[in-house]
């Protein structure tokens, strides 16, 4: 059974992931972003189901495409270089989903823009955090 300290750690990691995803969304989905329209041409795959931490496997598999979009952005939009930002997210995702069980991600048929993709994972983080508090 999860201890209160492990639950707290999970919550903090989810909050960190949530803040990173929100920062990316705010930096991108903004008319002041000169590359916005081109960023919206990138296609992302969405999870068929995202209700548990193991489903973060689906986010992990889309981090490389996410980095490619961020490479288009101006560095002033974010505090970190895309590679470093994605690396940080990857570390959190790996810790949260765990590596004990191998989970095969199932994707929905519909693809999504980067804005829809980020909003989906932001909602996921918020949903899991609410169950922990």
């Amino acid at each position: 059974a999860p201890t209160s300290s492990s639950t707290k750690k999970t919550q903090l990691q989810l909050e960190h992931l949530l803040l990173d995803l929100q920062m990316i969304l705010n930096g991108i989905n903004n008319y002041k972003n000169p590359k916005l329209t081109r960023m919206l041409t990138f296609k992302f795959y969405m999870p068929k189901k995202a209700t548990e931490l193991k489903h973060l496997q689906c986010l992990e598999e889309e981090l490389k495409p996410l980095e490619e979009v961020l490479n288009l952005a101006q560095s002033k939009n974010f505090h970190l270089r895309p590679r470093d930002l994605i690396s940080n997210i990857n570390v959190i995702v790996l810790e949260l989903k765990g590596s004990e069980t191998t989970f095969m991600c199932e994707y929905a048929d519909e693809t999504a823009t980067i804005v829809e993709f980020l909003n989906r994972w932001i909602t996921f983080c918020q949903s899991i955090i609410s169950t922990l508090t």
Epitope: P34, T37, L40, T41, K43, P65, E68, L72, T111
Partner: antibody
Framework: QVQLVQSGGGVVQPGRSLRLSCAAS????????MNWVRQAPGKGLEWVTS????????EYADSVKGRFTTSRDNSKNTLYLQMNSLRAEDTAVYYC????????????WGQGTMVTVSS | SYELTQPPSLSVSPGQTATISCSGD??????AYWYQQKSGQAPVLVIY???RRPSGIPERFSGSSSGTMATLTISGAQVEDEADYFC???????????FGGGTKLTVL
């Protein structure tokens, strides 16, 4: 309604200059990046240049780099294309087009203006 | 330089289905957009993000994408659908904006 109205086309000799204008109405012009797209007679569409909402970022196709300059006056809701050192291959219908902020394409187009470069 | 490849022309009878293809190496990770351009007019967006239809575009227009191929389908083509159709997207890095060469659809 949302509208882009173009002016300034015409016939010009090779090596000469021409300026096109695109007047926007029905939306907050200063919130949108804008583009110029051209179409040579009987040919396909070719993106030419783009300019950010505030004019700070400009990009050009290799075919016009160093010869064409795009600019905007947000107080007049107007986009411009200054074309210098014109060549015969610049002969085309020029369209101004708005960058969408919700999808990855051009969502509003001007009516087009013909530029003919001929001696 | 990145290219999107379309067939130059297609002819169908009214009521038939018209299928226009657009091939591009980046399509597994890039959305396709389709513009209709009638003679002497500016282009009009008829499909965005592979499959989505802007408001005001008839239901007979649909889009799909699989692998490196995007497809525009007009089910039950009408005489008023006669036009040039251009696919549009960006290259692999998203840096360059690219149009296909266009397909002239004749409905007669």
């Amino acid at each position: 309604q949302v509208q882009l109205v173009q002016s300034g086309g015409g016939v010009v000799q090779p090596g000469r200059s021409l300026r096109l204008s695109c007047a926007a109405s029905g939306f907050t012009f200063s919130n949108y990046a804008m583009n110029w797209v051209r179409q040579a007679p009987g040919k396909g569409l070719e993106w030419v240049t783009s300019i950010s909402y505030d004019g700070a970022n400009r990009e050009y196709a290799d075919s016009v780099k160093g010869r064409f300059t795009t600019s905007r006056d947000n107080s007049k809701n107007t986009l411009y294309l200054q074309m210098n050192s014109l060549r015969a291959e610049d002969t085309a219908v020029y369209y101004c087009a708005r960058d969408s902020t919700t999808l990855g394409a051009f969502d509003v187009w001007g009516q087009g203006t013909m530029v003919t470069v001929s001696s | 330089s990145y290219e999107l490849t379309q067939p130059p022309s297609l002819s169908v009878s009214p009521g038939q289905t018209a299928t226009i293809s657009c091939s591009g190496d980046a399509f597994p990770r890039k959305f396709a957009y389709w513009y209709q351009q009638k003679s002497g007019q500016a282009p009009v967006l008829v499909i965005y993000e592979d499959t989505r239809r802007p408001s005001g575009i008839p239901e007979r227009f649909s889009g799909s994408s699989s692998g490196t191929m995007a497809t525009l389908t007009i089910s039950g083509a009408q005489v008023e659908d006669e036009a040039d159709y251009f696919c549009y997207s960006t290259d692999t890095t998203g840096t360059h904006r690219v149009f296909g060469g266009g397909t002239k659809l004749t409905v007669l």
